[in-house]
């Protein structure tokens, strides 16, 4: 199973922690960057760089931040109400199918394909056929000669929950 | 299918420590509160208290501070229990339950393990 | 603590027939939030309670229709609308409107 949960997987969200500021449900639920309390008469504001949520709720405990892992850069800082943004290093990509590690980009398209997208934190450069213009699938064939190219540069953060 | 299985029973003596444990399956274990109640015979329900897989925060019943203890293996989706010092008075059945992470829905159980037999006599 | 007690703590029942049973709190269920956290489990012999009825009148997924709760405040009911041979067994009220969450004695049903 995944060791991750995401306001989105929780829907809303919170946890208690001593001589945080407190103030009282509206409707049974708490504002983003806090959590309601054990007996439902409270919320308690998450703990910065700690822990956060992002929308009314009333879970009993907030979502611990992200820690971007070795490989991705920190684009911003966990905050009360926004989980950690963490990006893949310039050179690598995060598939969608595997969002736990980047990988790194191709440097190059296979033998009679050309390069029409660069590298992004979030897609490996795309090629396609010469003539064709049909995308290739993605893995390098063995022994095939490639055309280098350099990683692009982001053009947007990729935003990863946690 | 959620499933909670429990481990077996126990006879212990005055005194002594057990631990039970609670191997749930069938759901995403760190999603759900592991609730643990106590079945004295012939008697009603106490809830214990529970515990947070996401975090590993617990929230006691007052009565239970310092009487249970509850931990979990995430790697094994198992939750445990540990009651210290025992007496006779521990003797019941001890019953881990899920509920849900929000307070709206997290006072009520929709799953419980069979039940494990704790008796204490010398 | 709150205190939940429960009548009659025994009901001898006839199939078909409808059953009743009462559930009281020492104090009022109905929090800040305007819900009301009472609920009803079933503990047939030799099992581990089940969940019925969750929030006064919510039948948890799978229960017979035969079973309803109703009540507000301190005065709680569980209805059974024709009593089946499966349905015996201790039923017993709960709150979670007030930590620390506490039971009702429980109401034994039983087979004239």
């Known amino acids: 199973e995944s060791a991750l949960i995401t306001q989105q997987d929780l829907a809303p969200q919170q946890r208690a922690a001593p001589q945080q500021k407190r103030s009282s449900p509206s409707e049974g639920l708490c504002p983003p960057g806090h959590h309601i309390s054990e007996d439902g008469r409270d919320c308690i504001s998450c703990k910065y760089g700690q822990d956060y949520s992002t929308h009314w709720n009333d879970l009993l405990f907030c979502l611990r931040c992200t820690r971007c892992d070795s490989g991705e850069v920190e684009l911003s800082p966990c905050t009360t109400t926004r989980n950690t943004v963490c990006q893949c290093e310039e050179g690598t990509f995060r598939e969608e199918d595997s969002p736990e590690m980047c990988r790194k980009c191709r440097t190059g398209c296979p033998r009679g394909m050309v390069k029409v997208g660069d590298c992004t934190p979030w897609s490996d450069i795309e090629c396609v056929h010469k003539e064709s213009g049909t995308k290739h699938s993605g893995e390098v064939p063995a022994v095939e000669e490639t055309v280098t190219s350099s990683p692009g540069t982001p053009a947007s953060p990729c935003s990863l929950s946690g | 299918e959620v499933q909670l299985v429990q481990s077996g029973a126990e006879v212990k003596k005055p005194g002594a420590s057990v631990k039970v444990s609670c191997k749930a399956s069938?759901?995403?274990?760190?999603?759900?509160?592991m609730n643990w109640m106590k079945q004295s015979p012939g008697m009603s329900l106490e809830w214990i208290g529970r515990?947070?897989?996401?975090?590993?925060?617990?929230f006691y019943n007052q009565k239970f501070k310092g009487k249970a203890t509850l931990t979990v293996d995430k790697s094994t989706s198992t939750a445990y229990m540990e009651l210290s010092s025992l007496r006779s008075e521990d003797t019941a059945v001890y019953f881990c339950?899920?509920?849900?992470?929000?307070?709206?829905?997290?006072?009520?159980?929709?799953?419980w393990g069979q039940g494990t037999l704790v008796t204490v006599s010398s | 603590d709150i205190v939940m007690t429960q009548s009659p703590l025994s009901l001898p029942v006839t199939p078909g027939e409808p059953a009743s049973i009462s559930c009281r709190s020492s104090q009022s269920l109905v929090h800040s939030n305007k819900n009301t956290y009472l609920h009803w489990y079933l503990q047939k012999p030799g099992q581990s309670p089940q969940l019925l009825i969750y929030?006064?009148?919510n039948r948890f997924s799978g229960v017979p229709d035969r079973f309803s709760g109703s009540g507000s405040g301190t005065d709680f009911t569980l209805k059974i609308s024709r009593v089946e041979a499966e349905d015996v067994g201790v039923y017993y009220c709960s709150q979670s409107t007030h930590v620390p969450w506490t039971f009702g004695p429980g109401t034994k049903v039983e087979i004239k």
């Open positions: 929030k006064v009148s």
């Open positions: 339950a899920r509920s849900a992470y929000y307070f709206d829905s997290g006072g009520y159980f929709d799953y």
């Open positions: 515990f947070n897989p996401y975090n590993e925060d617990t």
């Open positions: 069938g759901y995403s274990f760190i999603g759900y509160f």
